[in-house]
């Protein structure tokens, strides 16, 4: 059988959700001394990306310029060293936003519950789109999809205290082109306790996931990397 | 601070229509909902619908779908209750409630309306 | 639709004494239960949530208790200022419904 480096871990630096004509820079994190790393767009080659010194850095960042609907897809990478090539990356959904209008964002009962309570979210815009996208803030990844002419609903059912946040909804006119962001709504849920005071909502760390990793190699690295080398041999 | 106004009363003929409103100030009219009560003397209150003003949303009880009819006016932050075909069971007080935190804790002074010939 | 039963429509009590009205759902409110205060002006005032939670500005002689179907309202020390009619409402599934309301009165 062909022999394949292991794949490369493909993120988005910031986030996956880029506006219309801003730049998008998407990290390949591969191998210390992989010499070429490719962006592959929708199955096609996108980019390729020369490492310099390739031995020294562990990965690269791919920029693109002016974001539009074009742009936006699902991307992938693979990286070689020497002349071996690695297996493809997962792929990663590059969404292009600020596309045409701005929706509403609204909640029911209200933006303040009590823990237990049915809650929904409504997103409303009037282009036309059938499409509608929820999304709390620092957890972008976990995207809320639901359907309707002009207005849209999110049953969140009886909420916790883990739903307090801020969210936002788009309006979508393919998987990968969003309209503005709504308005925040921030949504506050006291517990059972019986101290009735706000709670803060949870800090809105940026998603993880969304943090390109590159790191340059030490000498220290370099040792535990040769190491790790010279075990794997051991144990073929 | 939080005022609902309403006018105090309302005068209509059997089978005509009346338009109530609701003025609100001291808070984000767009961002909460809101809610029409009936009370009839001696009947308990009855809640007829809410909406949302900032898309016009509407949610009615069933009994009130084809009585009432809600809607707003976000440029002067008034919510309309349109009430149709009166007759003497709709003579009662109509309030108009929001809730800001977690149950009905802003009420207006409610208006009184008379149906009679 | 959940129904909501008071079953006294009126109370009369001296002032200094402490009054319970009690409030029956036809199904499970899940505690989503409020308790409303009508003065005889048809001023109207929110008084306790989700059962037992003291809204804002209400004096501490009002408490609210129950689970389930049954809830009550109490009112440690009638003072003048109370005379009203007290309702309840579930706030569990829509429409929201309210009780009867009960009229307390001083003897």
């Known amino acids: 059988p062909k022999q394949t480096l292991p794949k490369p871990i493909i993120r988005a630096e910031s986030t996956y959700m880029v506006p219309k004509e801003k730049q998008a820079t998407l990290c390949c994190q591969g191998s210390y001394g992989a010499v070429e790393y490719q962006l592959h767009f929708e199955g096609s080659l996108f980019a390729v990306e020369r490492p310099k010194p390739p031995e020294r850095i562990n990965g690269v960042k791919f920029h693109i310029p002016d974001m539009n609907s074009r742009k936006a897809g699902r991307y992938s990478c693979i990286y070689r060293v020497g002349e071996l090539w690695s297996e493809r990356s997962d792929l990663l959904d590059l969404v292009v936003t600020e596309m045409y209008d701005t929706p509403t964002l609204s909640v029911h009962p209200g933006p303040e519950v009590t823990s237990g309570e049915k809650v929904t979210f409504y997103c409303r815009l009037d282009t036309a789109t059938s499409m509608f996208l929820l999304l709390k803030e620092g957890r972008s990844r976990d995207v809320q999809r639901s359907y309707g002419k002009v207005q849209a609903e999110f049953p969140m059912g009886p909420v916790t205290t883990a739903h307090r946040g801020s969210y936002r909804c788009f309006g979508s006119y393919n998987n990968y082109a969003w309209s503005f962001p709504s308005e925040p709504v921030k949504l506050l849920v006291t517990g059972d306790i019986e101290n009735t005071s706000l709670a803060p909502t949870d800090p809105t760390f940026p998603d993880s996931w969304d943090t390109c990793l590159l790191t340059r190699e030490t000498g220290l690295q370099k040792d535990l990397a040769l190491w790790d080398h010279t075990a794997q041999n051991l144990l073929r | 601070q939080v005022q609902l106004q309403q006018p105090g009363a309302e005068l209509v003929r059997p089978g005509a229509s009346v338009r109530l409103s609701c003025k609100a100030s001291?808070?984000?009219?767009?961002t909460y909902w809101m809610h029409w009560v009936k009370l009839r003397p001696g009947q308990g209150f009855e809640w007829?619908?809410?909406?949302?003003?900032?898309?016009?949303?509407?949610n009615y009880n069933e009994k009130f779908k084809r009585k009432a009819t809600l809607t707003v006016d976000k440029s002067s932050s008034t919510a309309y209750m349109q009430l149709s075909s009166l007759t003497s069971e709709d003579s009662a007080v109509y309030y108009c409630?929001?809730?800001?935190?977690?149950?009905?804790?802003?009420w207006g002074q409610g208006t009184s309306v008379t149906v009679s010939s | 639709d959940i129904q909501m039963t008071q079953t006294t429509s009126s109370l009369s009590a001296s002032l200094g004494d402490r009054v319970t009205i009690s409030c029956r759902a036809s199904?499970?409110?899940?505690?989503?239960l409020n308790w409303f205060q009508q003065k005889p002006d048809g001023t109207v005032k929110l008084l306790i949530y989700?059962?037992?939670r003291l809204h804002s500005g209400v004096p501490s002689r009002f408490s609210g208790s129950g689970s389930g179907t049954d809830y009550s309202l109490t009112i440690s020390n009638l003072e003048q200022e109370d005379i009203a009619t007290y309702f309840c409402?579930?706030?569990?599934?829509?429409?929201?419904?309210f009780g009867g309301g009960t009229k307390l009165e001083i003897k």
């Open positions: 409402q579930q706030g569990n599934t829509l429409p929201p419904t």
């Open positions: 989700f059962t037992s």
């Open positions: 007829i619908g809410e909406i949302n003003p900032g898309n016009g949303g509407t």
């Open positions: 199904q499970d409110v899940r505690n989503f």
């Open positions: 001291g808070y984000t009219f767009t």
């Open positions: 409630a929001i809730r800001l935190r977690f149950a009905l804790d802003y």
